[in-house]
Amino acid sequence: KIDACKRGDVTVKPSHVILLGSTVNITCSLKPRQGCFHYSRRNKLILYKFDRRINFHHGHSLNSQVTGLPLGTTLFVCKLACINSDEIQICGAEIFVGVAPEQPQNLSCIQKGEQGTVACTWERGRDTHLYTEYTLQLSGPKNLTWQKQCKDIYCDYLDFGINLTPESPESNFTAKVTAVNSLGSSSSLPSTFTFLDIVRPLPPWDIRIKFQKASVSRCTLYWRDEGLVLLNRLRYRPSNSRLWNMVNVTKAKGRHDLLDLKPFTEYEFQISSKLHLYKGSWSDWSESLRAQTPEEEPTGMLDVWYMKRHIDYSRQQISLFWKNLSVSEARGKILHYQVTLQELTGGKAMTQNITGHTSWTTVIPRTGNWAVAVSAANSKGSSLPTRINIMNLCEAGLLAPRQVSANSEGMDNILVTWQPPRKDPSAVQEYVVEWRELHPGGDTQVPLNWLRSRPYNVSALISENIKSYICYEIRVYALSGDQGGCSSILGNSKHKAPLSGPHINAITEEKGSILISWNSIPVQEQMGCLLHYRIYWKERDSNSQPQLCEIPYRVSQNSHPINSLQPRVTYVLWMTALTAAGESSHGNEREFCLQGKAN
């Protein structure tokens, strides 16, 4: 704390508030009889800037010129030093450094809506650190003037509170802003404008959409606008898109027909308005209207595939599969699929509606020529039916694709390659690549996947529903008219050694040899496509290397004979399984002693 100036005075020139970069004169003078006792010559007056000595003088007064003060406040204190005593505080002064206002820049005025009021904004420029008074002046026709002040350090906006009317839309108005503080003043360049230049319409409101006869092709957007609006901008997009479609319309009078909307799609619509072709500014965008367009009957055709399974001498099972239409093809919510099965010679037809899934299985006689047609239906109609003649897809051996291979291609992809069939390759109309998880029981409930490939292609990358460490049965069909040929292969996208070996469940003796039977390794432990089984055996209690027999893996095989065992010798047997990545651990061990006669 600095005491009131009882012992002396400090005077400041030109003021306690000065311009950045200017000089201030500080004078400290003692009052009569306030100096050091006895020897007034010993008076030593010291001037401190904060806690640092900047000047001193022997006598009754001290004069100091100070420059280079920073923005803000600097404290000066004058003290008296006498011999053999502490310094005594005389008086203090705070000097505040600020800046004169810079010229306000980019003055712009706007009236929001025809009934709004004129408000202006500007850029203040550098902070003055001082109370700065801004005066905004607007002059119009017939010597009319309006003035508004704001007394705030950070003022850059003022509303006149007056409304410009469209009676004389070409009349000129001029705005100017002047900034004044204790260190100076500055005025902006004048900004001249007309009613049409500064009125920014309110955004359109009450937006509605109508579809005549519930059709997407007869769609009208309606809205309400202020009275003087001449131009509108419409923008619309599907709700899941980031890109807008833009339309500019003149004299729309609150309605516009949209012709390019997609059916059964949620759209977002917004509208903006403007009073004049090249004057003024666009309104803000209106609030969004979200609306779903009506359905239209499906377009495109279903991709249909099938599988035949022999049941007995007179019956066969047909399983039909189809893929969902794309959203753009379905053009609505698919309510059901219509499947028609027909015997072509007898003309008998059976139609069934399938809901909730994309497959259908039925049993038909093995005789006759059968065809199916499948279509998708929404509330507006059905797609064109996809027709397929049921044939034996692998009957034509000469149409079978050759040298089929399946190789892992990155994560969860398999590249299938083949060579065209020996029979005239140009006869091939298309290839179909089919794949499904390999289940030893040949389970027909396992989902089927397929893709179609053009006749000149000899490879296909399969990635849909492909999992790591799972073996897939892959078939390549070559189709030509009412004939088909096929080749198959096993493939996986990623593999490692199986987690366990086969479980031997029985060993039986047959005419001096043995038959080993085993249980398949659970699918989830196979870790890819099995290539071989190995059967190991050695004499019990022997330290010799075991003998082994390697059997190529076949899906249906679960037993194998061995005829190299000696009679009346007890053997230990076990099995392993191999993938391309390596061999499994041992399965269970079984002991067996052949009872037959020695050779």
């Epitope: 600095i2 009131a4 100036c5 005075d9 400090v10 005077t11 400041v12 306690h16 508030v17 500080i26 803000g72 406040t73 404290l75 000066f76 008086c91 203090g92 002064a93 705070e94 505040f96 600020g98 902070d127 003055t128 650190h129 001082l130 109370y131 007394k151 350090i153 204790s182």
Partner: nanobody, 119 residues
Framework: QVQLQESGGGLVQAGGSLVLSCAAS????????MSWYRQAPGKQRELVAE???????TYADSVEGRFTISRDNAKNIVDLQMNSLKPEDTAVYYC?????????????WGRGTQVTVSS
């Protein structure tokens, strides 16, 4: 912000004296500077005298030695003792307070009091 109320103006003969007083009310904390300004008809407003919260003063050259400014920090009052008045001292006298507002100064003004010096 601070409200300022001036008093003490009036008509006085040349050579006479007057004391103007200004009282600050409202949020009067941290008043850095209290000042007197004057504005004669048709002229710019000019600084007469100012006093900081530490007691340092500034005077316009035209009033130095004749006018004395003093301040009571406790009561937020500033007085201007005007002696040896001259006709050219005739003006409306305004009180001003500069207050800290963050790292800036915010000013408040009184409505003014008329001083007329007749010859």
């Amino acid at each position: 912000q601070v409200q300022l109320q001036e008093s003490g103006g009036g008509l006085v003969q040349a050579g006479g004296s007057l004391v103007l007083s200004c009282a600050a009310s409202g949020s009067a904390a941290l008043i850095f500077l209290m000042s007197w300004y004057r504005q004669a008809p048709g002229k710019q407003r000019e600084l007469v005298a100012e006093v900081s919260r530490y007691g340092s003063t500034t005077y316009a050259d035209s009033v130095e030695g004749r006018f004395t400014i003093s301040r009571d920090n406790a009561k937020n009052i500033v007085d201007l003792q005007m002696n040896s008045l001259k006709p050219e001292d005739t003006a409306v006298y305004y009180c001003k307070a500069d207050q800290y507002y963050g790292d800036s100064l915010r000013s408040s003004w009184g409505r003014g009091t008329q001083v007329t010096v007749s010859s």
